[in-house]
């Protein structure tokens, strides 16, 4: 294939330096609804058809992506050279922003494997810039939440400071699929369901006297329940005493259920009470063991290399807390008899 014949698209990614955001490129021709053809000027015996349609991103399941270095180096395989870029079918996901993502990205269907193929490919020239103008203080976030069961909206971050009237025509995609009905800078959702969750992309065209390019932003949309009104509850330990063997290692697990909170800062820690003294124990990191729409179960263990006589006099306390309040559960060790 010859990249000189690829259809070319120019894209601009203006990222906010104060927030994490992602970006995507679709393996798509400028007008995906049209049927495009890859003409071949010589056929090998395997390739019988005279024309092969270049399908829109909805149909392409297996594509190859390349990066064209600016220094005249040959094309590179994105899989190996760029660990922060992930290929998912016909979409290229950029996990971290930065001007180093600027460059030319080429995609083509994998199924064409003849050296005689004339270009059946798309070349995307991506320019990445940090956001400079602070004129729009309340621009929409790249992570937006929709409250299940209520009315909500998804705003295009790069256009959220413009009124609907002055906003250019916007092209929206959800999880890589074109949302042909949506054309404004805001998608209004009459009633939010869990299927509204996903990766939304908004594109609009910007032009100057020389050229035009597509300004793109990516929004991660979560569907959420209302914030919990309850403090966390401890699921384990249930008993306040635990039979142990002296001299043996011991692990005590603390499992707690935290209700959903939009701003989630769970606390789960172990501390030890010994007569009048009380101190926090440095224990392994807490880990989430189950996460649902409504709540999350977090576990944190305390590990004793070997149980001593002194440990029998102590109380081991698990402390859990969210924005509503805290809960504790203490455990007293008891020597196993017999």
């Amino acid at each position: 294939f010859n990249i000189s014949g690829c259809s070319t698209k120019k894209l601009l990614w203006t990222y906010s330096t104060r927030s994490e955001e992602e970006f995507v490129l679709f393996c798509d021709l400028p007008e995906p609804q049209k049927s495009h053809f890859c003409h071949r000027n010589r056929l090998s015996p395997k390739q019988v058809p005279e024309h092969l349609p270049f399908m829109g991103s909805n149909d392409l399941s297996d594509v190859q992506w390349y990066q064209q270095p600016s220094n005249g180096d040959p094309l590179e395989d994105i899989r190996k050279s760029y660990p922060h870029i992930i290929q998912d079918k016909c979409t290229l996901h950029f996990l971290t922003p930065g001007v180093n993502n600027s460059g030319s990205y080429i995609c083509r269907p994998k199924m064409i494997k003849s050296p005689y193929d004339v270009a059946c490919c798309v070349k995307m020239i991506l320019e990445v810039k940090p956001q400079t103008n602070a004129s729009c203080e309340y621009s929409a976030s790249h992570k937006q939440d929709l409250l299940l069961g209520s009315t909500g909206s998804i705003s295009c971050p790069s256009l959220s400071c413009q009124s609907d009237a002055q906003s250019p025509a916007v092209t929206w995609y959800k999880n890589g699929k074109l949302l042909s009905v949506e054309r404004s800078n805001r998608i209004v959702v009459d009633e939010v369901y869990d299927y509204h969750q996903g990766t939304y992309v908004c594109d609009y065209t910007q032009s100057d006297t020389v050229s035009s390019w597509t300004v793109r932003a990516v929004v991660q949309v979560r569907t959420i329940v209302g914030d919990t009104k309850l403090k966390p509850d401890i699921l384990d330990p249930v008993e306040d005493t635990l039979e142990v063997e002296l001299g043996k290692p011991l692990t005590i697990s603390c499992k707690a259920r935290f209700g959903f909170e939009r701003v989630f800062n769970p606390v789960i820690k172990w501390y030890i009470k010994d007569s009048d003294l009380e101190w926090e124990v440095s224990v392994p990191e807490a880990k989430s063991i189950k996460s649902t729409l409504k709540d999350e179960i977090i576990e944190r263990n305390i590990i004793l290399e070997k149980v001593t006589q002194r440990d029998l006099r102590r109380k081991f306390v698990c402390f859990v807390q969210n924005s509503i309040g805290n809960t504790t559960q203490s455990v007293q060790l008891k020597e196993k008899r017999g």
Partner: antibody
């Protein structure tokens, strides 16, 4: 076509420069120009490649690094400089051309070979 | 470097028979593999590229398959003219599409 020159009978420890000359095409197109050798009765062994694009990127077999240098000396010639030659380097040295991915090719395979030039290392 | 391990070193089969040659790469080479045929005193001839694509003019009796690290060349309906040494070659290394390591070669003897 491709033609190699510079093969010779040399003593162990000597150096040698081999030249590959292209005709009928020039390096203005994007190619990988490579050197491959074949010892008598043995298999093909890749040595090094140079990209004919503006970057002139090079790629060497790990055993060849440090004792071989591939260079593009003009728009139609590529050289291979070899140092500290030993009897194990005795072989037919061939120049081969591979297309570059994205410039008419899907994978970089050899579609043009020279006849080779014989290098004999012996005391 | 990618290391290409080719098996067997030699194989013998009757006219009309089938031979299978395997090539294993030390890392995923994403189908960037070619197969060559070399007869004594001649230059190697490209048979298959991109793991499974037949070079123009090569009979369809030659079939390339495989993916990831495992690749196979199958020659069916063997002819006397197929007696030669066959080599696999990788053209992918660390994200670059560059010709590099060959397999050790397989000598095909046609009886």
């Amino acid at each position: 076509s491709l033609e190699e020159s510079g093969g010779d009978l040399v003593k162990p420890g000597a150096s040698l420069t081999l030249t590959c000359t292209a005709s009928g095409f020039s390096f203005v197109s994007m190619y990988w120009m490579c050197w491959v050798r074949q010892a008598p009765g043995k298999g093909l062994e890749w040595i090094a490649c140079i990209y004919t694009g503006s970057s002139g990127k090079t790629h060497y077999a790990s055993w060849a690094k440090g004792r071989s240098t591939i260079s593009k000396t003009s728009s139609t010639t590529v050289t291979l400089q070899m140092t500290s030659l030993t009897a194990a380097d005795t072989a037919l040295y061939s120049c081969a051309r591979a297309g570059s991915v994205g410039y008419g090719y899907d994978t970089a395979y050899f579609n043009l070979w020279g006849p080779g030039t014989l290098v004999t290392v012996s005391s | 470097d990618v290391v290409m391990t080719q098996t067997p070193a030699s194989v013998s089969a009757a006219v009309g028979g089938t031979v299978t040659i395997k090539c294993q790469a030390s890392q995923n080479i994403y189908d960037n593999l070619a197969w060559y045929q070399q007869k004594p005193g001649q230059r190697p001839k490209l048979l298959i590229y991109g793991a499974s694509n037949l070079e123009s003019g090569v009979p369809s009796r030659f079939k390339g398959s495989g993916s990831g690290t495992e690749y196979t060349l199958t020659i069916s309906d063997l002819e006397c003219a197929d007696a030669a040494t066959y080599y696999c070659q990788c053209s992918y290394d660390g994200g670059s599409y560059v010709p590099n390591a060959f397999g050790g070669g397989t000598e095909v003897v046609v009886q």
